[in-house]
């Protein structure tokens, strides 16, 4: 004969545990029903009566099967530098994430506690590591033969155009100026932008005669977040 199915509340067999979506009530010493997400325990179980559940009130929630006496409060409304990516419901907390052009400088269990604007690389510096939702932009000096003339959290250093006849040589913050009307560009026209969010970091040039000149040498790869420094500007 199949074993009888026990209905809550019931006393568990010695050494056994309660089933899924049940909990052991120490006072009643019985296995009792949990409340479903969106509910909480209004009345705890006894030896003869099961848990009584009730719906969460407005601005409160429970995300899991539970036996908590009160639902959890939803987080405060999203700040102006955030967007609400998940609304507060009876079954889930509000989630705030940083709006485009910002990154999460201080995260919490879900969403973001503190957003900060993505660092902007100043002229002579380019984005060396795009920002992400959780990391700032990294800026680095433009390598010889490249330039950036913008203050931007998305622009990378770009190669100087190749002139038939150079009027003004390019440097780290300025493209070359050609005297002929049809320069040979080493790249396609138009600025190269990285998608938002982007991340840059501090940049240090070695000593050079002019602040605008390119650092003596180097090629780079992206890296993690860092505080603002030479070559970057805050918002």
């Amino acid at each position: 004969l199949p074993a009888q199915v026990a209905f809550t509340p019931y006393a568990p067999e010695p050494g056994s545990t309660c089933r899924l979506r049940e909990y052991y009530d120490q006072t009643a010493q019985m296995c009792c029903s949990k409340c479903s997400p969106g509910q909480h325990a209004k009345v705890f179980c006894t030896k003869t009566s099961d848990t009584v559940c009730d719906s969460c009130e407005d601005s409160t929630y429970t995300q899991l099967w539970n036996w908590v006496p009160e639902c959890l409060s939803c987080g405060s409304r999203c700040s102006s530098d955030q967007v609400e990516t998940q609304a507060c419901t009876r079954e889930q907390n509000r989630i705030c994430t940083c709006r485009p052009g910002w990154y999460c400088a201080l995260s919490k269990q879900e969403g973001c506690r503190l957003c900060a604007p993505l660092r902007k690389c100043r002229p002579g510096f380019g984005v060396a590591r795009p920002g992400t939702e959780t990391s700032d932009v990294v800026c680095k000096p433009c390598a010889p033969g490249t330039f950036s003339n913008t203050t931007s959290s998305t622009d990378i250093c770009r190669p100087h155009q190749i002139c038939n006849v150079v009027a003004i040589p390019g440097n780290a913050s300025m493209d070359a100026v050609c005297t002929s009307t049809s320069p040979t560009r080493s790249m396609a026209p138009g600025a190269v932008h990285l998608p938002q969010p982007v991340s840059t970091r501090s940049q240090h040039t070695q000593p050079t005669p002019e602040p605008s000149t390119a650092p003596s040498t180097s090629f780079l790869l992206p890296m993690g977040p860092s505080p603002p420094a030479e070559g970057s500007t805050g918002d």
Epitope: T132, A143, R201, M223
Partner: antibody, heavy 118, light 110 residues
Framework: EVQLVQSGAEVKKPGATVKISCKVS????????IHWVQQAPGKGLEWIGR????????EYAPNFQDRVTITADTSTDTAYMELSSLRSEDTAVYYC???????????WGQGTTVTVSS | EAVVTQSPATLSLSPGERATLSCRSS?????????ANWVQQKPGQAFRGLIG???DRAPGIPARFSGSGSGTDTTLTISSLQPEDFAVYYC?????????FGGGTKLEIK
């Protein structure tokens, strides 16, 4: 003149650890990321990871992140790549580089051959 | 994990011909998400970065090399092959916090 000079060839046993150095000159090491790339015999390139010598921040390829440590010593202008728990498939040439898809500063070390054999 | 697929694996052409090498991203459009780059490797020589930002030639790279991107694909075109262009070409795509190289295309003389 820009140069990246790597340490010599290594022969290691499976399970061992190897540490390769990359001494840079001709530029300020803090201005650029140093990358490490693997090329196994007859195979293509695999990006291992990079270090930002300015602050020591690192990022690693998912395939390597559990076994690799990349560091940089700005006082000696040297970057290091340490690979642990070596196995036969780690037999390869390892290159350090300033190559970076966000810049146009393109210099590579001469490569270090690592042979893993019992 | 992201996969970068290059095609063809081998391309046999003659000097003067046009070469088209393709690179496909397993996730997302290369023009916005992956910041496509192309690197050249010749036997016994150092690697050389050719293209950055999907379509920017690196300083000193001849005008016959050009890059373009559309959707999940990025392409390296060599308009008129010179003898020194026969080599292995790798594309590299950026995935949030790491680079991924394609398997390479060997460009050989027909």
């Amino acid at each position: 003149e820009v140069q990246l000079v790597q340490s010599g060839a290594e022969v290691k046993k499976p399970g061992a650890t190897v540490k390769i150095s990359c001494k840079v000159s001709g530029f300020n090491i803090k201005d650029f990321y140093i990358h490490w790339v693997q090329q196994a015999p007859g195979k293509g390139l695999e990006w291992i990871g990079r270090v930002d010598p300015e602050d020591g921040n690192t990022e690693y390829a998912p395939n390597f992140q559990d076994r690799v440590t990349i560091t940089a010593d700005t006082s000696t202008d040297t970057a290091y790549m340490e690979l642990s728990s070596l196995r036969s498939e780690d037999t390869a040439v390892y290159y350090c580089s300033t190559w970076d898809g966000f810049s146009y500063f393109d210099y590579w070390g001469q490569g270090t051959t690592v042979t893993v054999s019992s | 994990e992201a996969v970068v697929t290059q095609s063809p694996a081998t391309l046999s052409l003659s000097p003067g011909e046009r070469a088209t090498l393709s690179c496909r991203s397993s996730t997302g459009p290369v023009t916005t998400n992956n910041y496509a780059n192309w690197v050249q490797q010749k036997p016994g020589q150092a690697f050389r970065g050719l293209i950055g930002g999907t379509n920017d030639r690196a300083p000193g790279i001849p005008a016959r090399f050009s890059g373009s991107g559309s959707g999940t694909d990025t392409t390296l075109t060599i308009s008129s092959l010179q003898p020194e262009d026969f080599a292995v070409y790798y594309c590299a795509l950026w995935y949030r916090n790491h680079w991924v190289f394609g398997g390479g295309t060997k460009l050989e003389i027909k």
